[in-house]
């Protein structure tokens, strides 16, 4: 039975040209995290493997940095980066947990972080 929950940074906004940290945290389970995949729409941005470390997609090599922790840092943001991002936790023995973050990239400087929320 999957008992874990994923807490994410929720709905967030950031300024064009700036950077943002995407964070997820898996709690309420003793399952072992084997790998975390970060996806944007239908693209795989990055992989963090518990044993092997980080790999960044060749498509995003220049704009994505690993961390902090299991999070992901997006740099040189453009308006096209607006959209849904998913952290996909592959765990044993539970299986897969998915968290969702919505990022809005703004032209102006009124970018503010939204509230945190949980996805069971």
């Amino acid at each position: 039975m999957m008992t874990g929950t994923i807490e994410t940074t929720g709905n967030i906004s950031a300024e064009k040209g700036g950077s943002i940290i995407l964070q997820c945290h898996l709690s309420s389970t003793t399952a072992q995290v084997t790998q975390v995949n970060w996806e944007q729409q239908d693209q795989l941005l990055a992989i963090c493997n518990a044993d092997l470390g980080w790999h960044i997609s060749p498509s995003f090599k220049d704009r994505v940095a690993p961390g902090p922790g299991l999070g992901l840092t997006l740099q040189s943001l453009t308006v096209n980066d607006t959209g849904e991002y998913f952290c996909i936790y592959h765990t044993y023995p539970d299986g897969t947990y998915t968290g969702r973050i919505f990022l809005e990239v703004l032209e102006s400087s009124v970018a503010e972080h939204g509230a945190r929320f949980q996805i069971p």
């Epitope: 992989i47 470390g53 790999h55 060749p58």
Partner: antibody, heavy 119, light 107 residues
Framework: EVQLVESGGGLVQPGGSLRLSCAAS????????MYWVRQAPGKGLEWVAY????????YYPDTVKGRFTISRDNAKNSLYLQMSRLRAEDTAVYYC????????????WGRGTLVTVSS | DIQMTQSPSFLSASVGDRVTITCKAS??????VAWYQQKPGKAPKLLIY???ARHTGVPSRFSGSGSGTDFTLTISSLQPEDFATYYC?????????FGQGTKLEIK
């Protein structure tokens, strides 16, 4: 069992067009990013195209950019490569390959289909 | 573009031998390297990904190592079915590139 079966190869004149297909089975096709890779006779491997799992993003090397188009139909479990303005140097066996779910490497490949560009 | 240079291009060895193939990247690719085996008229098969991780079902006699620019594929004890051509590939950045191949032949 993962299976990728290419088809559509053949003899085509320089400047002509051809559409290759790759039929996928044994896995949930829509969950995987896909590639085309080619191999000229007696030569090494050359990456030709990439498409994301939903078909939104595509990438090509400069050698084929503007001439080749990769696409997919997830409802039909099929991958395609539309090739136009073909040149003699495009002669090769064309393989479709699946991107691993663990990494960005290509974990399963088809047997390939031969494309010969000659007058 | 990142060049992947394999050496040697040809290698003669006997069953039971320990064999090492090297691959040098023209710039740092971290551990974004895979190794493939290809037999004549057949599709390539993934052996190693992430520079050192064995793909499902690959025998333990195959091992990969390295990071940055220098990588090796080692076959600890050659078996008859291992005679084939081996390719390294980098997937750190586009365009994805392969080494020119190493043909492993029976001595």
């Amino acid at each position: 069992e993962v299976q990728l079966v290419e088809s559509g190869g053949g003899l085509v004149q320089p400047g002509g067009s051809l559409r290759l297909s790759c039929a996928a089975s044994g896995f949930t096709f829509s969950d995987y990013h896909m590639y085309w890779v080619r191999q000229a006779p007696g030569k090494g491997l050359e990456w030709v195209a990439y498409i994301s799992k939903g078909g939104i993003s595509t990438y090509y090397p400069d050698t084929v950019k503007g001439r080749f188009t990769i696409s997919r139909d997830n409802a039909k479990n099929s991958l395609y490569l539309q090739m136009s303005r073909l040149r003699a140097e495009d002669t090769a066996v064309y393989y479709c390959a699946r991107q691993s779910s663990y990494d960005f490497a290509m974990d399963y490949w088809g047997r390939g289909t031969l494309v010969t560009v000659s007058s | 573009d990142i060049q992947m240079t394999q050496s040697p291009s040809f290698l003669s060895a006997s069953v039971g031998d320990r064999v090492t193939i090297t691959c040098k990247a023209s710039q740092d690719v971290g551990t974004s390297v895979a190794w493939y085996q290809q037999k004549p008229g057949k599709a390539p098969k993934l052996l190693i990904y992430w520079a050192s991780a064995r793909h499902t079902g690959v025998p333990s006699r195959f091992s990969g190592s390295g990071s940055g620019t220098d990588f090796t594929l080692t076959i600890s004890s050659l078996q008859p079915e291992d005679f084939a051509t081996y390719y390294c590939q980098q997937y750190s950045s586009y365009p994805l590139t392969f080494g020119q191949g190493t043909k492993l032949e029976i001595k």
